[in-house]
């Protein structure tokens, strides 16, 4: 599946568009908003009733090379007494992001866009219980 | 940019870093994964910090549709199904990369853009301070 072309219902293709070879697209990887700083709630991953840890994955042939993944610390959730309650479930929350993959074929290099599923954090859910006959 | 290991037999002229502009195949690897969080799980309803999902659409962006989470309550749902305001429903936010059409409206010319999305909510036990 390909990235959808611009629908004519929205707008006409401007004359100023750069020429692009068929089957490919031009991508500027100078990131817009690269330097914006996010004021994330501090220690949310430790204070959550479904706490999680972070792991950094590194791949030099990917842009960005660093992707952070979360892993739930427990199967159950932490109750008011600080104990794990296994009648509840800690579950991962996931989000897709795009990365650019660099591929080497001999001495030539090609670039491919890739969707990556990132685990962002965890939430505590009430399990759906089925009694098996 | 980031350093790329190079095949020793290749000419030295190749830049070790990612170039600023690249030509990319139009086919996206893993494109067909399910992007509608409502269909992928019902965690948003079953969580102790449930959330609503709002559709954010922008034809100048790929993906054009992004789902934003908004926590349904200030507090968290307790075992009795009531909101416990001694706990907090807090959005889990993540920076993701999307494609922005640049120049605008061009079908095959993009720039990477970093955006902040709320993906879901989690229940947090706050540390309490009594202000003198």
């Amino acid at each position: 599946r390909k990235i959808p072309k611009v629908g004519h219902t929205f707008f006409q293709k401007p004359e100023s568009c750069p020429p692009v070879p068929g089957g490919s697209m031009k991508l500027d990887i100078g990131i817009i908003n690269e330097n914006q700083r996010v004021s994330m709630s501090r220690n949310i991953e430790s204070r959550s009733t479904s706490p999680w840890n972070y792991t950094v994955t590194w791949d030099p042939n990917r842009y960005p090379s660093e992707v952070v993944q979360a892993q739930c610390r427990n199967l159950g959730c932490i109750n008011a007494q600080g104990k794990e309650d296994i009648s509840m479930n800690s579950v991962p929350i996931q989000q897709e992001t795009l990365v650019v993959r660099r591929k080497h074929q001999g001495c030539s290099v090609s670039f491919q866009l890739e969707k990556v599923l990132v685990t962002v954090g965890c939430t505590c859910v009430t399990p759906v219980i089925h009694h098996v006959q | 940019g980031i350093t790329i290991p190079r095949n020793p037999g290749c000419p030295n002229s190749e830049d070790k870093n990612f170039p600023r502009t690249v030509m990319v195949n139009l086919n996206i690897h893993n494109r067909n994964t399910n992007t509608n969080p409502k269909r992928s799980s019902d965690y948003y309803n079953r969580s102790t910090s449930p959330w609503n999902l709002h559709r954010n659409e922008d034809p100048e962006r790929y993906p054009s549709v992004i789902w934003e989470a908004k926590c349904r309550h200030l507090g968290c749902i307790n075992a009795d199904g009531n909101v416990d305001y001694h706990m907090n429903s807090v959005p889990i936010q993540q920076e993701i990369l999307v494609l922005r059409r640049e120049p605008p409206h061009c079908p095959n010319s993009f720039r990477l853009e970093k955006i902040l999305v709320s993906v879901g909510c989690t229940c947090v036990t706050p540390i309490v301070h009594h202000v003198a």
Epitope: S39, S41, I44 | C71, L74, N88, V124, P126, V131
Partner: nanobody, 116 residues
């Protein structure tokens, strides 16, 4: 350090109105929500009303819905609680609460008395 200054408490008759205010100063950034709890002698503190900072979403206890209105002023880091049609059972110490997601600050409280 965060400071909370509450004002507006006092004695009124049933059916009257009162407006409570709370101003936050100091390192009150990344506010999650701002609101009010209340407590009567021998009882637990109960949630009255709260307003989420990011989108002004409001929540109320069932006992005050339709009578109390919470509002905020982002530029001044203040929150107001407009209390109308007050009843004797609204008599309590009202505490301002500033919530920063993982940390919560409680004010010292202001007394509201409703009696004829």
């Amino acid at each position: 350090e965060v400071q909370l200054v509450e004002s507006g408490g006092g004695s009124v008759q049933p059916g009257d109105s009162l407006r409570l205010s709370c101003a936050a100063s100091g390192r009150a950034n990344s506010i999650n929500w701002f609101g009010w709890f209340r407590q009567t002698p021998g009882k637990e503190r109960e949630f009255v009303a709260g307003i989420r900072w990011s989108d002004a979403y409001t929540e109320y206890a069932n006992s005050v819905k339709g009578r109390f209105t919470i509002s905020r002023d982002n530029s001044k880091n203040t929150v107001d609680l407009q209390m109308n049609s007050l009843r004797p059972e609204d008599t309590a110490v009202y505490y301002c609460v500033l919530d920063l997601s993982t940390v919560r600050y409680w004010g010292q409280g202001t007394l509201v008395t409703v009696s004829s």
